[in-house]
């Protein structure tokens, strides 16, 4: 059962698995969320009757029942983890503590202007966790303006006090607001020699990788896989850190992989979400449950739905025992992950699937591609929104892209001459415009925020937020698009579609079925040379064939330019103006999203 | 019981030299890689050098062209020659077998099998 609302002058009694350092109780709720054993907590707001010593102390609690017994105590706030949600969840917090000193190891300090100017430092900063700053009205001289950035074992406070003009907050990397450097590459057969600060157990060197993403010390990993000679340590997945946060030594190794972590584009992979299946692989662990199941897949259903189940192992049935049945082993560890992996022994093993909200839902796989052909089948594009106008009357204006469930990003140029939002209808999960009745369900539009930088298309800031009046529920075909990483800037992407319903040539009409073309990126150096009465700034992408013939047209603008990479899609481009359509030597030019990422967040949220 | 015994630890001159030595017992010494990481007060876990069981070499670069790494997989034992000595590189030092790293704040961590440590003092 989901319980999202706080008690107040609670204490839950007993189940103390440990305690953490947070500003606020709704920081206590979400680190209790990403503890792997914490379903609910205790915080204990400052307050003159509590010992100064309990202010800011966060008890992370479990519970076989899920609950505890409540207990009446002034200045205690209780409650739940939100694992047992099934909403979105995100890690990022943006909230400015004033007045409260959050300690750890002050391992930077410098000058800065602003507190943002200093949680903007923190965020770029590698080792950052969280900051103190002191404001101009601090009493001592020379510590005013200084800026401390911190870091702790938890990610988390190692005691919080009262300190009058001093502000402090946390890094904003889950948040995806970090500029640091996005290095998806694992490389084989090294060894990262660097210091441990954890080990784990892993299937695989992917899972070894997400486990160190979202570990708020580990910077880099390395993994033995089952091959390795070793046995002992076959399995491992080793948690590294280094002072200049890079590895310093690599060791040439067989059957062993290292790799980064990607907190700096957590919010464009899945981190939580270890969706594959392990064959003949036997996870051990503290056994929760054994029950029949028919297959592996409902075992990994009953794992998902079973609150304190972490991973499961199947034995599948023997010939006609059971009704066919086999058995699902649900299990947890202290950590969430196995306490030891075996192989051989003809199980197949999988991760809780509960965690899969903690990541952003336009990681999730869509359904896969269909080759050839210029017409999209449903689902093929599910993040693809037909934009209308019903003035004068009702008609397809512009393509766009759902990249939040409240929001749609589009190009600034397709509302020339709109007075107001009224007038719009987002249309989503459609493949035929034939498909739009009267009485066919639609998103109104709220509000209308073009970038106030635009003026035209060809001189670029061609893009544009809409916010609709109701929320998206995602499915199969309507769900998010993944906006580009900022650590993904060198990124060369090889697998990009322009979609939407615009016209076919030039002199044409809005097509009925929703069309895509795979088009090759191209050089802003080369676009420029097919450009020469433009400027093409590093804010445009471009996209074309030099033979030309496939390109984005009239009724196209808005929609996507939709690169896939690494098995997850990105919003590279919005189609934005080309001379003329598909022409020799004319690439189609797009708003460079990845410039955009900043002004989206801002907009999006915004309180 | 795995056992790794460290000596040749001592103090001495910058510029001089020491040899480190460490004698290995209770496993396959053959088949191990093994390393030597350092620590000095104050700060992180360092490491050294390291050499692979088939004798494959790499160093830190703050000690590359000074110290060589050698194993006697006869005699169950893996040297450290230290030359040109400075005075940040006095400090503890650790021999390790299959370690892949020390640990955040002491060298000795549950990865791998580790000695007790030998003393090395540089003076200017």
């Known amino acids: 059962e989901c319980v999202t609302q706080l008690l107040k002058d609670t204490c839950f009694e007993g189940g103390d698995i440990t305690t953490v350092f947070t500003p606020s109780a709704k920081y206590c709720q979400v680190v209790c969320t990403y503890h792997p054993r914490c379903l609910l907590f205790t915080f204990t707001a400052e307050s003159p009757s509590e010992d100064p010593t309990r202010w800011f102390t966060c008890v992370l609690k479990d519970s076989v029942t899920e609950t505890l017994p409540r207990v009446n105590r002034t200045a205690a706030i209780s409650g739940y983890s939100f694992k047992q949600c099934s909403h979105q969840i995100s890690a990022c917090n943006k909230d400015i503590y004033v007045d409260l000193d959050m300690k750890g190891i002050n391992y930077n300090s410098s000058v800065a202007k602003s507190a943002q100017e200093c949680q903007e430092r923190c965020t770029d900063d590698v080792h950052c966790h969280f900051f103190t700053y002191a404001t101009r009205q601090f009493p001592s001289l020379e510590h005013r303006n200084i800026c401390l950035l911190k870091h702790t074992q938890t990610g988390t406070p190692t005691r919080i006090t009262k300190l009058d003009k001093v502000v402090s907050g946390f890094s904003l990397k889950s948040c995806a607001l970090s500029n640091l450097a996005c290095i998806r590459d694992i490389f084989p057969n090294t060894v990262f020699a660097d210091s441990n600060i954890d080990s784990v157990m892993a299937p695989d060197a992917f899972v070894c990788g997400r486990i160190c993403t979202h570990h708020p010390g580990c910077l880099f990993f390395t993994f033995f896989s089952q091959e390795w000679p070793k046995e002992s340590q076959r399995n491992l997945c080793l948690l590294k850190t280094s002072e200049s946060g890079l590895p310093s030594t690599r060791i040439k190794k067989s059957k062993a992989l290292s790799g980064f972590s990607l907190q700096s584009c957590r919010h464009s992979i899945p981190v939580f979400c270890h969706s594959s299946f392990y064959h003949d692989t036997d996870f051990l662990g503290e056994e929760l449950d054994i029950v029949a199941a028919k297959s592996h897949e409902a075992c990994q259903k009953l794992c998902t739905n079973a609150v304190r189940c972490q991973f499961f192992t199947y034995t599948p049935a023997q010939a006609s025992c059971n009704e066919g049945k086999g058995k699902c082993y649900l299990k947890l560890s202290s950590n969430g992950s196995p306490t030891k992996i075996l192989h051989g022994r003809g199980g197949i093993s999988g991760y809780t699937l509960r965690l899969c909200k903690m990541d952003n839902e336009c990681t999730t796989k869509i359904k896969p591609r269909i080759v050839g052909g210029t017409a999209s089948v449903r689902g093929e594009w599910p993040w693809q929104v037909t934009l209308h106008t019903t003035s004068p009357t009702q008609r397809h204006l512009c393509g766009g892209s759902i990249i939040g469930n409240q929001w749609i990003l589009t190009a600034a140029h397709c509302f020339y001459g709109v007075e107001s939002p009224k007038i719009l209808r987002v249309y989503s999960g459609i493949l035929n415009q034939s498909e739009i009745k009267e009485d066919t369900s639609f998103f109104g539009v709220q509000e209308i925020i073009i970038h106030d930088q635009y003026k035209m298309a060809e001189s670029g800031y061609d893009i544009a937020l809409l916010k609709l009046e109701t929320t998206v529920n995602y499915t199969d075909s309507q769900r998010p698009i993944c906006l580009p990483s900022k650590g993904d800037r060198n990124v060369i992407y090889t697998d990009c579609w322009v979609t939407g319903w615009g016209y076919r040539k030039l002199r044409d009409k809005i097509q009925n079925t929703l069309q895509k073309a795979k088009i090759p990126l191209v050089t802003n150096e080369e676009c420029q040379k097919r450009y020469r009465g433009h400027k093409i700034t590093h804010k445009m992408i471009c996209a074309g064939y030099r033979e030309g013939g496939k390109d984005a047209c009239k009724g196209d603008s808005g929609g996507p330019l939709s690169c896939k990479h690494n098995e997850v899609w990105h919003l590279v481009g919005i189609t934005s103006w080309g001379e003329g359509c598909a022409q020799r030597e004319r690439p189609g030019v797009y708003t460079n999203v990845v410039e955009y990422v900043d002004w989206i967040l801002e907009k999006t949220q915004a309180v | 019981q795995v056992q790794l015994q460290e000596s040749g630890g001592d103090s001495v001159q910058a510029g001089g030299s020491l040899r480190l030595s460490c004698i290995a017992s209770?496993?396959?010494?053959?088949?191990?890689?093994m390393g030597w990481y350092r620590q000095a007060p104050g700060h992180q876990c360092e490491f050294v050098s390291h050499?692979?069981?088939?004798?494959?070499?790499y160093y830190a670069d703050s000690v590359k062209g000074r110290f060589t790494i050698s194993r006697d997989n006869a005699k169950n034992t893996v040297y450290l020659q230290m030359n040109s000595l400075k005075p940040e590189d006095a400090a503890v030092y650790y021999c390790a077998a299959d370690a892949w790293g020390g640990g955040r704040s002491t060298c000795v961590n549950p990865i791998g099998y580790w000695g007790q440590g030998t003393q090395v003092t540089v003076s200017s």
């Open positions: 050499i692979t069981n088939d004798g494959t070499t």
């Open positions: 209770g496993f396959t010494f053959d088949d191990s890689d």
